[in-house]
Amino acid sequence: HTAAQDNCTCPTNKMTVCSPDGPGGRCQCRALGSGVAVDCSTLTSECLLLKARMSAPKNARTLVRPNEHALVDNDGLYDPDCDPEGRFKARQCNQTSVCWCVNSVGVRRTDKGDLSLRCDELVRTHHILIDLRHRPTAGAFNHSDLDAELRRLFRERYRLHPKFVAAVHYEQPTIQIELRQNTSQKAAGDVDIGDAAYYFERDVKGESLFQGRGGLDLRVRGEPLQVERTLIYYLDEIPPKFSMKRLTA
């Protein structure tokens, strides 16, 4: 796995332990919490990051994600089960044997059940809407400049191919970034839109996951773009299965 050779760190994930014990003495990094070897040339999967976050000391700063998400991430943080590739397992259970099914970004998509609950497949989240509100500025940002800057950010910082950034909408002070990535579109080596959205979310909250890199400094034509609120909505390839009782509550 590629990691910084000089001081053996993982540029894309600071929640790792690295040592020069890879093939030929190369630097190898393992995610905290799971011990899974990670590829430091790309984003680490959200499942491994969430697991690492839960393994961190309890007094560490951990902000629960907002609970207004569309496919609602009301459950906030939990210690997930990840498969050998670092993806969320379709079924997640807690220590009290309460289980539920999740999508590819780890958000619950069924009612909670017991150990008999079956989750046949990991359903892919193929459309993510990142809804931002920026702090007041002297005037509105130029839409095309804003669009170009956000596309540049996702391409350069998160290495997400621009074809997966479907649109950037802007009505001051609200910015919406639409990410779309069907199973058929995602080639080997492509960054997952869910992972890019998670890294972006942590960046805008000032909790960057990148090693040693400065925090996110978003500027549009030199004017700082400061985000004061983030909501993320997830749409799955197969609609979620919640009971009517929950939907009418």
């Epitope: 040339s41 540049r152 391409r155 997400l160 191919h161 074809k163």
Partner: antibody
Framework: QVQLQESGPGLVKPSGTLSLTCAVS?????????WSWVRQPPGKGLEWIGE???????NYNPSLKSRVTISVDKSKNQFSLKLNSVTAADTAVYYC????????????WGQGTLVTVSS | DIQMTQSPSTLSASVGDRVTITCRAS??????LAWYQQKPGKAPKLLIY???SLESGVPSRFRGSGSGTEFTLTISSLQPDDFATYYC??????????FGQGSRLEIK
């Protein structure tokens, strides 16, 4: 085997427009790749001009942005470069290249075509 | 722009020698670096990408290393075919993509 072939006038008058086309074979121009132009003045180093991804907006080197246009013709499996208001400083060998990755490194190149700007 | 600086600009060596070319970036580019070989009158040829990954068909005597701001291209045992100009290129940023000024490897 992927092959790229540049074509266009070898001589352009100052203040005129340089126009080149790159024909792609062995790969679809609509594939998951970037298509770039790179130039090399005689005896000098390489300079990236810009790129295009079919279905996306082109990106240009800021130093040339005001003068350059890159476009794609999917039906002919080719892409083109237009550079206007040329001067002698634009005399160079112009290469078209296929870019791999989210941001390009260049795995296939055309053989290059020398464009001289002179009256 | 990210500036790429190569050294030396010219180096003289003999067949069988081990040679090293260095490329420095003006800011950290992670491992997003490629190396090319160019012979007179020919297009550049990709040797190395992602700082250390050998392009298919390139002889194993070519080796790339480094990350962040400092990178090296090493040719372990020079062959007659290796005398050429070598360029590094960063692809951390596309605004713009930039190359080093080149390092000419000549026969001593």
């Amino acid at each position: 085997q992927v092959q790229l072939q540049e074509s266009g006038p070898g001589l352009v008058k100052p203040s005129g427009t340089l126009s080149l086309t790159c024909a792609v074979s062995g790969d679809s121009i609509s594939s998951n790749n970037w298509w770039s132009w790179v130039r090399q003045p005689p005896g000098k180093g390489l300079e990236w001009i810009g790129e295009i991804y079919p279905g996306g907006n082109p990106n240009y080197n800021p130093s040339l942005k005001s003068r350059v246009t890159i476009s794609v013709d999917k039906s002919k499996n080719q892409f083109s470069l237009k550079l206007n208001s040329v001067t002698a400083a634009d005399t160079a060998v112009y290469y078209c290249a296929r870019g791999s990755g989210v941001i390009s490194y260049f795995d296939y190149w055309g053989q290059g075509t020398l464009v001289t700007v002179s009256s | 722009d990210i500036q790429m600086t190569q050294s030396p600009s010219t180096l003289s060596a003999s067949v069988g020698d081990r040679v090293t070319i260095t490329c420095r970036a003006s800011q950290s580019i992670g491992h997003w670096l490629a190396w090319y070989q160019q012979k007179p009158g020919k297009a550049p040829k990709l040797l190395i990408y992602k700082a250390s990954s050998l392009e298919s068909g390139v002889p194993s005597r070519f080796r790339g290393s480094g990350s962040g701001t400092e990178f090296t291209l090493t040719i372990s045992s020079l062959q007659p075919d290796d005398f050429a100009t070598y360029y590094c290129q960063q692809y951390s940023s596309y605004s713009p993509i930039t190359f080093g000024q080149g390092s000419r490897l000549e026969i001593k």
